[in-house]
Amino acid sequence: QPPPPPPDATCHQVRSFFQRLQPGLKWVPETPVPGSDLQVCLPKGPTCCSRKMEEKYQLTARLNMEQLLQSASMELKFLIIQNAAVFQEAFEIVVRHAKNYTNAMFKNNYPSLTPQAFEFVGEFFTDVSLYILGSDINVDDMVNELFDSLFPVIYTQLMNPGLPDSALDINECLRGARRDLKVFGNFPKLIMTQVSKSLQVTRIFLQALNLGIEVINTTDHLKFSKDCGRMLTRMWYCSYCQGLMMVKPCGGYCNVVMQGCMAGVVEIDKYWREYILSLEELVNGMYRIYDMENVLLGLFSTIHDSIQYVQKNAGKLTTTIGKLCAHSQQRQYRSAYYPEDLFIDKKVLKVAHVEHEETLSSRRRELIQKLKSFISFYSALPGYICSHSPVAENDTLCWNGQELVERYSQKAARNGMKNQFNLHELKMKGPEPVVSQIIDKLKHINQLLRTMSMPKGRVLDKNLDEEGFESGDCGDDEDECIGGSGDGMIKVKNQLRFLAELAYDLDVDDAPGNSQQATPKDNEISTFHNLGNVHSPLK
């Protein structure tokens, strides 16, 4: 090996280099000095560094370290930020489509309900959006409010369209009767189950992504300790004091220094790994009633079923409600419904089923795959930073913090450093308060992710209840669990052409629905139209 270059007799190279860091040369000795006041770059002989230069090197070293850390996390940070924004927007699109589908169902099947129904549907979906974004709203209350609001309109417009104005102040009574008489049967309960499960999962998914951003931002902007600044200075700049401008730190030495500097950050690793694996588990479970796209885009059809149920039981209900919400005079307004549709199969609008479009579900899986490539991000940080800063390959002819060596020996380096400060002590200090805080947040989200009531191993939970409906099961075809109805034949698989907004955005006029202006094939029965002498005990 060639001998090390002799020290710069005039400190010229050091001066020109230092001037790039700090304009002006007042701190740089013209010729080597004893350097007895130095605290970091402890000289073995004359040195081209002063105390002020040392301080500047420490500051620069810490700034360099922060920049390296930020560039190390840039790709990961962008991945999570971009996806959090994309998913938030996508969920908003799903909510908007779901609202349009529901409005279209009312417009096409129950035009007499539309003005009020649109309002109630709008309020419901606004609450859905707010809930996803973290608002403190109870999903059961949202669903109850929707049905409480709809029933008086259904009763006065569909079941008793002949009601005089004097009888229209019974809304409060009708709202109460809706729950007491289970007017909509088990449908509200089914919707509560599906909506609460799917929205809960969606909400925690977004929360987890946002916390991911917070974790990266926290570690991205860490301020490194003075001890770390000293170690970095010794590694990157102390060689300059000896005029060794072209010498690179030893790779092994860099790893030791980085592990010391990042001891606190690396403590995040365990919780970060758990975060990604828990998020993966959540995403794997986001299907059927745990998939908001599936649930919300199929809601209109369940609401339609619930109205049909009311209509089928309208005779009994009208009598009971007539007694319950009775007004002074009783007069018969209707004695039967005239079935509107015996033999009319109403016009069906089909939403194109696009097999290969990107869906929310595939996008989620893709995100998880990318995140998994960052699962060792924190444990690998020291190595990553060393590989992205100048280090000597093969640990030969490199700087070990004190001198130029032919081969790096960790033991020798530690012995040489023990009088300067203890690496072990630095490690034992424990994480910064901000790091401890973010670890607590990760623990909390991991707990939430784990305790989500998700189906394990893709087996559906069958909440078979005594009324005889299975709130968790929608048949054998996973892709068509909820929705897929006669109101529009929406295929739930690949329903949302991912962010292809313009191609897919539904107007109320073109959402799935059955038009009442359908051409009658036959003369379908309806108990609701062409009313004759029909009963209502309400005045």
């Epitope: 369940t302 039967a336 409906f469 109805s485």
Partner: antibody, heavy 119, light 107 residues
Framework: QVQLQQSGAELARPGASVKLSCRAS????????ISWMMQRTGQGLEWIGE????????YYNEKFKGKATLTADKSSSTAYMQLSSLTSEDSAVYFC????????????WGQGTLVTVSA | DIQMTQSPASLSASVGETVTITCRTS??????LAWYQQKQGKSPQLLVY???TLPEGVPSRFSGSGSGTQFSLKINSLQPEDFGSYYC?????????FGGGTKLEIK
């Protein structure tokens, strides 16, 4: 035109289960409820229950809870009824019928499936 | 559940005659009543709904009447194809129930 095609006759042992099918065609399967009726030889009709194929919600006549289980497969437009713990009392013809969207009226019926329970 | 009582349980009549079958309900069902005809070995067919409305395709010799708890089905000028069993059914709400049936035979 609307058609409901039921599966063939079943002979079963007491205690066994049978699953009857009813394949719908000629209309949008999910737009209407499917009800099932029982008719013992020479007797009247009894409503067993109904399923809303769109949401999978089922309603049962109290008398048949635990005896009948209704399901539907939207992809094949088929409704199913499983009868369990069969006894000779369950020997009957079982009909599926399509209702109208707003009443318990049955304008369309399957041809019926005879179930015979015998040791 | 609403009980449906049909009478008579059976009757014999000749082609060309007029017959009336009655149905009584255990509670007021207003006009929520349907009638079905069933021939031997076949499935029932809807004849009347809302007590008196005939679906398209049902001959006008069939007519329904009544409301509340008393209902009747009248067949004018009996035709050979009219023989079979007749059932009333309420469509007032869940569960729908059927009468025991009336068997109409050729005299």
């Amino acid at each position: 035109q609307v058609q409901l095609q039921q599966s063939g006759a079943e002979l079963a042992r007491p205690g066994a289960s049978v699953k009857l099918s009813c394949r719908a065609s000629g209309y949008t399967f999910t737009s209407y409820g499917i009800s099932w009726m029982m008719q013992r030889t020479g007797q009247g009709l009894e409503w067993i229950g109904e399923i809303y194929p769109r949401s999978g919600i089922t309603y049962y006549n109290e008398k048949f809870k635990g005896k009948a289980t209704l399901t539907a497969d939207k992809s094949s437009s088929t409704a199913y009824m499983q009868l369990s713990s069969l006894t000779s009392e369950d020997s009957a013809v079982y009909f599926c019928a399509r209702d109208v969207s707003d009443g318990y009226l049955f304008p369309y019926w399957g041809q019926g499936t005879l179930v015979t329970v015998s040791a | 559940d609403i009980q449906m009582t049909q009478s008579p349980a059976s009757l014999s009549a000749s082609v060309g005659e007029t017959v009336t079958i009655t149905c009584r309900t255990s509670e007021n069902i207003y006009s929520y009543l349907a009638w079905y005809q069933q021939k031997q070995g076949k499935s029932p067919q809807l004849l009347v709904y809302n007590a008196k409305t005939l679906p398209e395709g049902v001959p006008s010799r069939f007519s329904g009447s009544g409301s509340g708890t008393q209902f009747s089905l009248k067949i004018n000028s009996l035709q050979p194809e009219d023989f079979g069993s007749y059932y009333c059914q309420h469509h007032y709400g869940t569960p729908p129930t059927f009468g025991g049936g009336t068997k109409l035979e050729i005299k």
